[in-house]
């Protein structure tokens, strides 16, 4: 009989749907299920999760989550982790070198550690060494060949020959820049006395009475001398190298800095004259700055005196910069002393000199111009008539003169006329009209008159407006319009309703809400009445709110 | 007579780069300011894209900003146009023009599609 | 931005009459403003700039109007070529913007 398989106890991991499937449990074998494992585990086969299979001798995989190690929690100062993979699996093995310089606890090269249970099996770790070093005229007192950090090594001289002063013996120390100095043996004869004195000058040090070869010592100037060839000389074979020169320098006075000043000025001041190479903080005026653009910078004292030589360089901002009908610009909003910026124009405006752009510079003082852009007006279009000048371009306020082709006048039988550039352009077109196109006076209306004066002939496509009386309604367009010699159709003006007293007595009424003796009504008003008292209605309701058509109103009549 | 030419490629794929380059000839790109980009979307109406002047300097389209370069080449005598991240959205007829004297180019359709 | 409105989107005229488009600002934009015309499959061409200036070469039966934020664009008597879309354009301050478009076909 098959035996069949109880629940798993994934140890690390579960079953998916593990509450739903617990009901199919005892598995027959041959059964799969998937099952994930927890973070730091993984399948046999490497992956988060897989398939367990219940066989003839139980689940398969036996052991379905294995531990698994992470490179990144491996922590190696002065070594290396081999590249191969990031993550291993329980036993896994792991190899890592030492950088030159550094050995592992055994004095190795390089070692491993290995994934277990509970993690990597150690933290590798890379200890600093020194190797036997090279013995000058000397020998080591003990046989190891590598050497742990503060580790001592003893040396002695051979015959002849000493370390320091006499002595024959001496140790150095493994260090973290490696041995504290070589085991050198020297022969008296080599050694120095005390360096040169020079002018000007000392060595950085106090003198000793004998040096080492190849001892080096260094020297410095006093203020005001340059140094002069290398600062330091070196003993050898019994004698030191040249010593440097102190040469006298210039030094630079208190630096008086245009639109600007050194900062701490006051306190600084009893300093000077400075040596060369001396470097001083500095600030600028409002509207100016350093060359790099800034508004603090170094100034510093050289050879040639004080660079930079104009500390503070004006500077021109674009809010300084007015234009009317035009824009700036955007690349920046500060410009540097001789920087350039851009403008345009918008249409129908142009520059001084007739153009759609221009520039203006930053200068000492502030900007080279400021940018103006010019009301101008195009060359018209003529019609029925030509200029009497070539130019293409008009500023505000420039007249054009022009003519009319023959057969063709402006009014009153002239052929020449001007237009004037304003500020919406031309004054007007310059045309010119067939005489037979024109229209005379335009007719006169009943109670009403033209908001104009009229003139004796008016030129095609005029318009003429119209008003009525007070009170007069005017139907139809205001407007008549002069068209192949004729006028339009001009407006009437319709008669308003004049309501009277003696009108209202005879009808026994009065004006509802009114104590108006005469009223006037337009067209299309209506007039409320009311009966007088002690007089009664004697036509219908309407009546009482009479309208008034062109003149005429029905009163209504109480008794 | 100043005239002005747009080049480039009529198909952009979807999240690709929309490149034009408008030549400009009978003129120097130095005389002017308004060298500017117009788009107008098929059956729709005209949408400002940005302009710049000859030193190089920019005004673009806030609505495009994030996505939009024009540059100038004094040396070719010509201006160019970026669009990046394009979408079928950005499927239109490209002008370009020098927006002061009313100089216009053809005009090319790009289409943005797969 | 500055958005520009036109009324009416649309119109239907007869050769001969007078046609007018308005165009409204959101906010002043003193007299920067151009008047376009765009014929189908055209490339778009100036009429008017600096709201009643005539560009050159353009029939002065075009003519503009306006300040601040009332614009109008007049065609005092409409002429077979004139039937195409009209469009304001502000260039007071960036970023430059248009209006929506008036179409005028044949009644």
């Known amino acids: 009989e098959v035996k069949p398989c109880d629940f798993p106890e994934i140890q690390h991991g579960g079953l998916y749907y593990k509450s739903l499937r617990r009901l199919y449990f005892p598995a027959a074998a041959g059964q799969s299920y998937s099952y994930y494992c927890d973070q730091n585990f993984v399948t046999p086969s490497g992956s988060y999760w897989d398939y367990i299979h219940c066989t003839q001798d139980g689940w398969s995989p036996t052991v379905p989550c294995l531990r698994t190690c992470s490179k990144s929690d491996v922590e190696i100062e002065n070594g290396f982790i081999s590249e191969s993979s990031s993550i291993y699996i329980l036993n896994e093995e792991t190899q890592y070198n030492c950088k030159p310089g550094y050995a592992t606890a055994e004095g190795n090269s390089s070692g491993s550690i290995t994934c277990l249970q509970n993690g990597w099996s150690t933290q590798p770790i890379c200890i600093k060494f020194c190797d036997m070093p090279v013995f000058e005229n000397s020998r080591a007192k003990s046989n190891g060949m590598w050497f742990k950090l503060h580790d001592t090594l003893d040396y002695e001289c051979y015959d002849g020959y000493e370390s320091s002063y006499g002595n024959t013996t001496d140790s150095i120390v493994c260090g973290e820049d490696g041995w504290s100095h070589l085991p050198t043996c020297y022969n008296s004869s080599e050694n120095c006395g005390p360096p040169p004195p020079i002018s000007n000058g000392d060595t950085t040090s106090f003198p000793q009475k004998v040096y080492l070869p190849w001892s080096r010592v260094e020297y410095q100037c006093q203020s005001y001398y340059e140094l002069q060839g290398s600062k330091y000389v070196t003993c050898s074979n019994g004698d030191w190298s040249e010593p440097p020169r102190c040469i006298s320098m210039k030094p630079c006075e208190f630096p008086e800095i245009q639109h600007g000043h050194l900062y701490y000025e006051n306190t600084r001041r009893p300093y000077f004259p400075v040596a060369t190479g001396q470097s001083y903080s500095y600030y600028c005026d409002q509207n100016f700055v350093t060359p790099s653009g800034s508004y603090w910078d170094y100034i510093h004292c050289t050879q040639d005196g004080w660079l930079p030589t104009v500390p503070c360089l004006r500077t021109c901002s674009k809010s300084d910069i007015e234009i009317e009908n035009g824009f700036i610009s955007e690349s920046s909003s500060i410009y540097i002393l001789n920087k350039e910026i851009q403008y345009k124009c918008k249409p129908g405006y142009a520059t001084a000199d007739g153009n759609s752009s221009g520039s203006i510079t930053c200068l000492q003082n502030g900007w080279s111009a400021q940018p103006i852009c010019i009301k101008f007006c195009d060359m018209p279009v003529f019609e029925n008539s030509r200029a009497k000048s070539n130019g293409m371009r008009f500023k505000l306020h420039d007249t054009l003169d022009y003519e009319c082709y023959d057969g063709y006048e402006i009014s009153y039988g002239n052929t020449t006329g001007s237009i004037v550039c304003g500020e919406d352009g031309w004054s007007h077109f310059p045309t010119c009209y067939n005489s037979s196109e024109k229209c005379g006076p335009p007719p006169p209306i009943s109670n009403g008159d033209t908001t104009s004066f009229l003139l004796k002939v008016y030129v095609p496509q005029s318009r003429v407006e119209y008003q009525c009386q007070s009170y007069y309604e005017l139907q139809g367009s205001n407007y008549v319009t002069c068209s192949n010699g004729e006028w339009s159709e001009p407006p009437r003006c319709i008669h308003p309703c004049i309501i009277t007293e003696e009108n209202m007595n005879k009808n026994n009424i009065q004006l509802k809400g009114k104590s108006d003796i005469k009223y006037y009504a337009k067209t299309g008003d209506t007039i409320e009445f009311m009966c007088k008292l002690g007089y009664n209605a004697n036509t219908s309701v309407l009546s009482f709110q009479a309208v008034c058509r062109e003149g005429i109103v029905e009163y209504p009549r109480c008794e | 007579q100043v005239q002005l030419q747009e080049s480039g490629p009529g198909l952009v794929k979807p999240s690709g780069t929309l490149s034009l380059t408008c030549a400009v000839s009978g003129g120097s790109i130095s005389s002017s300011n308004w060298w500017t980009w117009v788009r107008q979307p098929p059956g729709k109406g005209l949408e400002w894209i940005g302009e710049?002047?000859?030193?190089?300097?920019?005004n673009y389209n806030p609505s495009l900003k994030s996505r939009v370069t024009i540059s100038v080449d004094k040396s070719k005598n010509q201006f160019s146009l970026k669009l990046s991240s394009v979408t079928a959205a950005d499927t239109a007829v490209y002008y370009c023009?020098?927006?002061?004297?009313?100089?216009w180019g053809q005009g090319t359709l790009v289409t943005v599609s797969s | 931005d500055i958005q520009m409105t036109q009324s009416p989107s649309s119109l239907s005229a007869s050769v001969g009459d007078r046609v007018t488009i308005t165009c409204r600002a959101s906010?002043?934009?003193?007299?920067?403003l151009g008047w376009y015309q765009q014929k189908p499959g055209k490339v778009p061409k100036r009429l008017i700039y600096?709201?009643?200036s005539l560009q050159s070469g353009v029939p002065s039966r075009f003519s503009g109007s306006g300040s601040g934020t009332e614009f109008t664009l007049t065609i005092s008597s409409l002429q077979p070529e004139d039937f195409a879309s009209y469009y304001c354009?502000?260039?007071?301050?960036?970023?430059?913007?248009l209006g929506p478009g008036t179409k005028v076909d044949i009644k």
């Open positions: 710049t002047y000859h030193d190089g300097s920019t």
């Open positions: 600096a709201a009643s």
């Open positions: 906010q002043d934009i003193r007299n920067d």
């Open positions: 354009l502000q260039y007071n301050n960036y970023p430059f913007t």
């Open positions: 023009l020098e927006f002061y004297f009313d100089y």
